[in-house]
């Protein structure tokens, strides 16, 4: 049960992937007044498997405290789990006007950078 | 001193850019025994200016506590400041052997994803 195969699968389950949640339109920060819910898809998870030699050394330097990054902007030592495709999201506002916002929700993810 | 120009410059200083530091080879995690220092260049800084509509809504949802990301993998609400080009780094190990590690140091950065 604890062999390499099972460990790799467990790590993969935490990897970069598309996730989905119903969210209130008003929390999207679009400035539209609406009490509706919409489905918002986003990307999250690890991209450790896609690390370059630079990333491995950067992680080692950060871990050893040998690098002094500027305050508030710690460098990223793996590619980022980010959307590679998007879709529009539609909803009804409080005036019963149908609104569509382009490229609001992710439809695919990748380890970018 | 507090006009728009200075604000823009200050923001620029926090933006994604190439940074450089002398670091001990032994802290690079390469497995090479060496007491040398090398120049390691890396990328850090904000990519807020490159945010998409998706990113703005994702940031709003996270700020409002309306999104439940999985534990330990908070989604990234802006492109990542990451290397776009790399260079080799060379150094002498304790046996006076010249070592070269490809693609170890960054030479250019960009807001990716």
């Amino acid at each position: 049960a604890g062999g390499p195969g099972s460990r790799a699968r467990a790590a993969g389950a935490r990897g970069c992937r598309l996730r989905s949640q119903l969210v209130p339109v008003r929390a999207l920060g679009l400035g539209h007044r609406s009490d509706e819910l919409v489905r918002f898809r986003f990307c999250s998870g690890s991209c450790r498997r896609a690390r370059s030699p630079h990333d491995l050394s950067l992680a080692s330097l950060l871990g050893a405290g040998a690098l002094r990054p500027p305050p508030g902007s710690r460098p990223v030592s793996q590619p980022c789990c980010r959307p590679t495709r998007y879709e529009a999201v539609s909803f009804m506002d409080v005036n019963s006007t149908w609104r569509t916002v382009d490229r609001l929700s992710a439809t695919a993810c990748g380890c970018l950078g | 001193a507090g006009g728009p120009g200075s604000r823009a410059r200050a923001a620029g200083a926090r933006g994604c850019r190439l940074r450089s530091q002398l670091v001990p080879v032994r802290a690079l995690g390469l497995g090479h025994r060496s007491d040398e220092l090398v120049r390691f260049r890396f990328c850090s800084g904000s990519c807020r200016r490159a945010r998409s509509p998706h990113d703005l809504s994702l940031a709003s949802l996270l700020g409002a506590g309306a999104l439940r990301p999985p534990p330990g993998s908070r989604p990234v609400s802006q492109p990542c400041c990451r290397p776009t080009r790399y260079e080799a780094v060379s150094f002498m190990d304790v046996n006076s052997t010249w070592r070269t590690v490809d693609r170890l140091s960054a030479t250019a950065c960009g807001c990716l994803g």
Epitope: R17, L18, S34, E36, V38, R39, S90, M92, W98 | -
Partner: antibody
Framework: EVQLVESGGDLVQPGGSLKLSCAAS????????MHWVRQASGKGLEWVGR??????????EYGASVKGRFTISRDDSKNTAYLQMNSLKIEDTAVYYC?????????????WGQGTMVTVSS | DIQMTQSPSSLSASVGDRVTITCRAS??????LNWYQQKPGKAPNLLIY???TLESGVPSRFSGSGSGTDFTLTISSLQPEDFEIYYC?????????FGQGTKVEIK
């Protein structure tokens, strides 16, 4: 808290009628489609029908087994949907769920009510 | 109507096992396929949206894949709370249809 609450389930004789209600709270559903799904005891899930939103002129569609007998309606001002069931048959006995389907390129049964029991028996 | 066929209809497994449930559509449905978990006496709960998107709050051990007519739901390491009934459902065409369900039981 976002929730749907069904009511109106009862014991009714074959050939009788019953009207189920589904009230939404914690959000408004005027932009969403409202569906009804049922489940007979120990059986799988069966789609009953749906009513679309105002943009789609409140269009309704029904499953073959209930078409012509059941009618779905909605009152967006009350955030409530209804299922009018006429000419009930013994095989209509089931737990009835109302479900919200939010707009999307691909749709899913997003928010489910707790279900209300309809028993058709003589 | 589009027929959805799930297999197996039931399976016995142990905690920690990797489990795969398949769902086949009678015609191509692209990725208009959702997976639900149902606990006794409760309404179903959406697990996987659009064939492979993990619904928020659902543990990462669940994953979905497939497109067209063949789809799978995988649980990478079964936990005690996963011994329930699972349904696939297509939203490609009206009437929306479900698979007959797969009951995951303790071995």
């Amino acid at each position: 808290e976002v929730q749907l609450v069904e009511s109106g389930g009862d014991l009714v004789q074959p050939g009788g009628s019953l009207k189920l209600s589904c009230a939404a709270s914690g959000f408004t559903f005027s932009g969403s489609a409202m569906h009804w799904v049922r489940q007979a005891s120990g059986k799988g899930l069966e789609w009953v029908g749906r009513i679309r939103n105002k943009v789609h002129r409140y269009a309704t569609e029904y499953g073959a087994s209930v078409k012509g007998r059941f009618t779905i309606s909605r009152d967006d001002s009350k955030n409530t949907a209804y299922l009018q069931m006429n000419s009930l048959k013994i095989e209509d006995t089931a737990v009835y769920y109302c479900v919200v389907v939010v707009p999307g390129s691909i749709e899913a049964f997003d928010i489910w009510g707790q279900g209300t029991m309809v028993t058709v028996s003589s | 109507d589009i027929q959805m066929t799930q297999s197996p209809s039931s399976l016995s497994a142990s905690v920690g096992d990797r489990v795969t449930i398949t769902c086949r559509a009678s015609q191509s449905i692209s990725t208009y396929l959702n997976w639900y978990q149902q606990k006794p006496g409760k309404a179903p709960n959406l697990l996987i949206y659009a064939a492979s998107t993990l619904e928020s709050g659902v543990p990462s051990r669940f994953s979905g894949s497939g497109s067209g007519t063949d789809f799978t739901l995988t649980i990478s390491s079964l936990q005690p709370e996963d011994f329930e009934i699972y349904y696939c459902q297509q939203s490609y065409n009206i009437p929306w249809t479900f698979g007959q369900g797969t009951k995951v039981e303790i071995k």
